[in-house]
């Protein structure tokens, strides 16, 4: 069942009369509740993302951020399911994976993550508005879809070469990280209403802004594990449509499994694949805590100005969301 | 100022299928997040599903009752939205509302700062 913290809008105090402290004492215990409230909501991830080396190429990498073990991934382009998506690979963890023109080695990267490589067809570049689906379907969570595009602003000569980064399951990532942040998050929450008994609440001053001026709310990310997800890129070559788009894809029974060998997936087993990288050490809290103070009107020194609605060129990697939440 | 409209709604037989649009005009480069949230007569806002960008990566997350009959997914050319929904049922009749903030928020209606006039679904039995 998937709940929501209820979180009554606050109106942020003047920055000169109460400061950013009276603020922040205030916001947090909401941030840290909602922290605690949300954090179990499986999340699909999708990433398209074009190679500097040849403009007719992009990667495409999918990932489930999730507790439970995935059943089946499908991938398509063109749309979702039911929207005229052409599938491109059914990945299945034991009878192995089945693939269709244009494409030419769908792999399992993690436990919880697979990508892609497309055949070229002959186009020059990739469309912007090329859509790429992957469905997971996992237990107990069930079914879930995510889709994601080229970024319209992709200049390949600007884009980085993508370094290597640990490959974690992610419901591991979710034990290590969401654990360990809930845990201390629940316990300086209790900490903080403990205190807040212990003495007068601070008055806050009705804001003098316009009244449509932003109200402090409660943000969380919805995986505190979404950082240590990222692992080496594949690359795509394709064109704006499928090579195959009126050819019909077998989705009825598991019979054409049958050919696969099982070793076909490619999955990675044990945890030799992921035990040798160390995980990343990332001040969750020291970012929240950053986003708060801009929130109160002092900006932290790495909080840029620009605000996107559509994605940052900078790669997965970049902060996430303009307050440097991840 | 940021301007959100939703269209794709209408009257659609039960096991029918919808897409919804939210288009996104105006001041774009302040939003961050985009959620689909639906309103039931006599029943309050409930949250559908959410997605957020950073970089080359999109993350979308669903409310429980979605169970994969719906999909969350973003033109990023034309700063458009879509709401694909399978499998519909009449308990999914209501109002459907799109919904932007410039902050990572989770599906919490009062954490979005810009809402669309919303456009209405209606699954007959």
């Known amino acids: 069942m998937r709940t929501e913290a209820q979180v009554p809008a606050l109106q942020p105090p003047e920055p000169g009369l109460e400061g950013a402290m009276g603020h922040r004492t205030l916001v947090l215990p909401w941030v840290l509740l909602t922290l605690c409230v949300t954090a179990g909501t499986p999340e699909v991830w999708v990433q398209v993302r074009m190679e500097a080396t040849e403009l007719s190429s992009f990667t495409i990498r999918c990932g489930f951020l999730g507790s439970g073990s995935i059943s089946l991934v499908t991938v398509s382009w063109g749309g979702p399911n039911g929207a005229g998506g052409t599938t491109l690979a059914v990945l299945h963890p034991e009878r192995g994976i089945r693939q269709w023109a244009p494409a030419r080695q769908a792999r399992w990267e993690t436990q919880s993550s697979i990508s892609l490589i497309l055949e070229g067809s002959g186009a020059s570049s990739p469309c912007a508005n090329t859509t790429f689906c992957c469905k997971f379907a996992s237990f107990p969570e069930g079914s879930w879809e995510a889709c994601g595009s080229l970024p319209p602003s992709s200049d390949p000569g600007l884009s980085a070469p993508p370094t290597p980064a640990p490959i974690l399951r992610a419901d591991l990532a979710g034990i290590l990280g969401v654990s360990g942040v809930l845990l201390f998050g629940c316990v300086y929450l209790l900490h903080l209403l403990r205190r807040h008994k212990h003495r007068p609440a601070p008055r806050l001053q009705p804001s003098r802004t316009s009244p449509q001026a932003p109200r402090a709310r409660a943000w969380a990310p919805s995986q505190a594990s979404q950082a240590a997800l990222h692992v080496p890129y594949a690359t795509i070559n394709t064109s704006c449509r499928p090579a195959t788009l009126d050819t019909a894809h077998p989705h009825g029974g598991p019979s054409w499994w049958a050919s696969l060998p099982t070793h076909a997936a490619h999955r990675p087993q044990g945890p030799a694949a992921w035990a040798s990288t160390p995980i990343p050490a990332r001040g969750s809290f020291v970012s929240v805590e950053n986003g708060l103070y801009a929130q109160a009107g002092e900006r932290p020194p790495h909080t840029g100005p620009g605000l996107t609605l559509f994605p940052d060129p900078r790669g997965p990697r970049a902060m996430e969301g303009p307050l440097g939440v991840r | 100022q940021l301007q959100l409209v939703e269209s794709g709604g209408g009257l659609v037989q039960s096991g029918g299928s919808l897409r919804l649009s939210c288009a996104a005009s105006g001041r774009t480069r302040s939003m961050y997040v985009m959620g689909w949230f639906r309103q039931a007569p006599g029943k309050e806002r409930e949250f559908v599903g959410r997605?957020?960008?950073?970089?080359?990566?999109?993350?979308?997350s669903y409310a429980d009752f979605v169970k994969g009959r719906f999909t969350l997914y973003g033109n990023q050319a034309r700063n458009t939205v879509y709401l694909q929904m399978n499998s519909l049922k009449p308990e999914d009749t209501a109002v459907y509302s799109c919904a932007a903030s410039k902050f990572p928020v989770s599906g919490v209606p009062e954490h979005y700062d810009y809402w669309g006039q919303g456009t209405q679904v209606t699954v007959s039995s």
């Open positions: 997605i957020k960008w950073s970089g080359d990566t999109t993350y979308t």
